[in-house]
Amino acid sequence: MAVTACQGLGFVVSLIGIAGIIAATCMDQWSTQDLYNNPVTAVFNYQGLWRSCVRESSGFTECRGYFTLLGLPAMLQAVRALMIVGIVLGAIGLLVSIFALKCIRIGSMEDSAKANMTLTSGIMFIVSGLCAIAGVSVFANMLVTNFWMSTANMYTGMGGMVQTVQTRYTFGAALFVGWVAGGLTLIGGVMMCIACRGLAPEETNYKAVSYHASGHSVAYKPGGFKASTGFGSNTKNKKIYDGGARTEDEVQSYPSKHDYV
């Protein structure tokens, strides 16, 4: 029961996270005009990964796409790539995890296959979350660098008379959405990996141990056949984990701790 809950929760958390990564990638407010210590302008500038926008006090908003690939900064291209990779991996992970869900029966799918699929989707979610966090962090670092550079030469002009006020940009809403979404996807992935451990079927979890009976050189595998030695007599409802016997319920209620990034 605990495995199903962990897997289901991991799926839902990852789903929310990937939806957030998609939303962040599409949002226009990756960087917004810094209004602090700036003359009050009647124009508000903000930029996304795909276009830049200007909102006038009149209420009119004009957005222009970046209709060039070669002319864009390499860092922006890198951020785009990271976010897209994150979305693609996340989407594939979601697809895989749907079939891996314990509550969904698809034909005669083996438990081992479900465990493998759960692990695969978990790893995909972790990488997806890391890609999003990395992409957003790279962009944030780029903003911080540009912010201080533009602050250093904010006022340019002749003879002290101010001619141009340079527009400075600060963190936009998309960055926070991206960080949170990346974190959720990462957590969801970790939960899926934890759930995978409890999903593994009996055969894959047995450890082959050689038992040497005195006077006989016969190797026994627990539960293989019922010998008078007493081994295997009640292994039917038990799984052997690292030499310790636990009931099926005990195995499923694996402890988990979730730290939010």
């Epitope: 009647a42 124009v43 200007v54 006090s57």
Partner: antibody, heavy 118, light 113 residues
Framework: QVQLVESGAEVKKPGASVKVSCKAS????????VHWVRQAPGQGLEWMGY????????KYSQEFQGRATLTSDKSASTAYMELSSLRSEDMAVYYC???????????WGQGTLVTVSS | DIVMTQSPDSLAVSLGERATINCKSS????????????LTWYQQKPGQSPKLLFF???TRQSGVPDRFSGSGSGTDFTLTISSLQAEDVAVYYC?????????FGQGTKVEIK
């Protein structure tokens, strides 16, 4: 067609208040910001402030902050400008105008002459 | 506040001749976000309300004759009437639409010589 029709001329005593109305027609009132500009006799144009009828957000020129109040009535498609503590230098033609691209004013009212005289 | 200075204060030009009005702002009106200059030109004929001629410094408002042209960037702007007509007699104002409070130039009176 798109037009802004202002209320009639007003004669007020110093210290009194005046409320000028500006009725919009021919367009969706809440989609455009309404600005107020005044022009003293023989003088240039002076921006007073604006109101966004959609959310009642307003901004004032420092000179009119606290003395001018911009409001709007969505149901009546009308914007109002109230100026209190009138002085002789407030005698002017008051215009309402609609905000357009580039924060420019594309449609203007005919103007309301406010005379301040004791 | 941004100071808008127009020159000359008044201008007398013969019919069919070119009229040029300059406008200088104390700060740049160029927005880096869209590379547009937030300067507007208005025409006010005697006894009438102002009329929009150009926004974004050079974008002509619909219905404005093409003998009118707007140019300039940053702090220096120009309104040109290529061939003055009798109906162009008016006061012309430039306006800062970038910084609050929006400020107007003192106006340039165009007359026929």
């Amino acid at each position: 067609q798109v037009q802004l029709v202002e209320s009639g001329a007003e004669v007020k005593k110093p210290g009194a208040s005046v409320k000028v109305s500006c009725k919009a027609s021919g367009y969706t009132f809440t989609s455009y910001v309404v600005h107020w500009v005044r022009q003293a006799p023989g003088q240039g144009l002076e921006w007073m402030g604006y109101i966004n009828p959609y959310n009642a957000d307003s901004k004032y020129s420092q000179e009119f902050q606290g003395r001018a109040t911009l409001t709007s009535d969505k149901s009546a498609s009308t914007a109002y400008m109230e100026l209190s503590s009138l002085r002789s230098e407030d005698m002017a033609v008051y215009y309402c105008s609609r905000s357009y691209y580039g924060n420019s004013f594309d449609v203007w009212g005919q103007g309301t002459l406010v005379t301040v005289s004791s | 506040d941004i100071v808008m200075t127009q020159s000359p204060d008044s201008l007398a030009v013969s019919l069919g001749e070119r009229a040029t009005i300059n406008c200088k702002s104390s700060q740049s009106l160029l927005n880096s976000g869209n590379q547009k200059n937030y300067l507007t030109w208005y025409q006010q004929k005697p006894g009438q309300s102002p009329k929009l001629l150009f926004f974004w410094a050079s974008t002509r408002q619909s219905g404005v004759p093409d003998r009118f042209s707007g140019s300039g960037s940053g702090t220096d702007f120009t309104l040109t009437i290529s061939s003055l007509q009798a109906e162009d007699v008016a006061v012309y104002y430039c306006q800062n639409d970038y910084y609050f409070p929006f400020t107007f130039g003192q106006g340039t009176k165009v007359e026929i010589k």
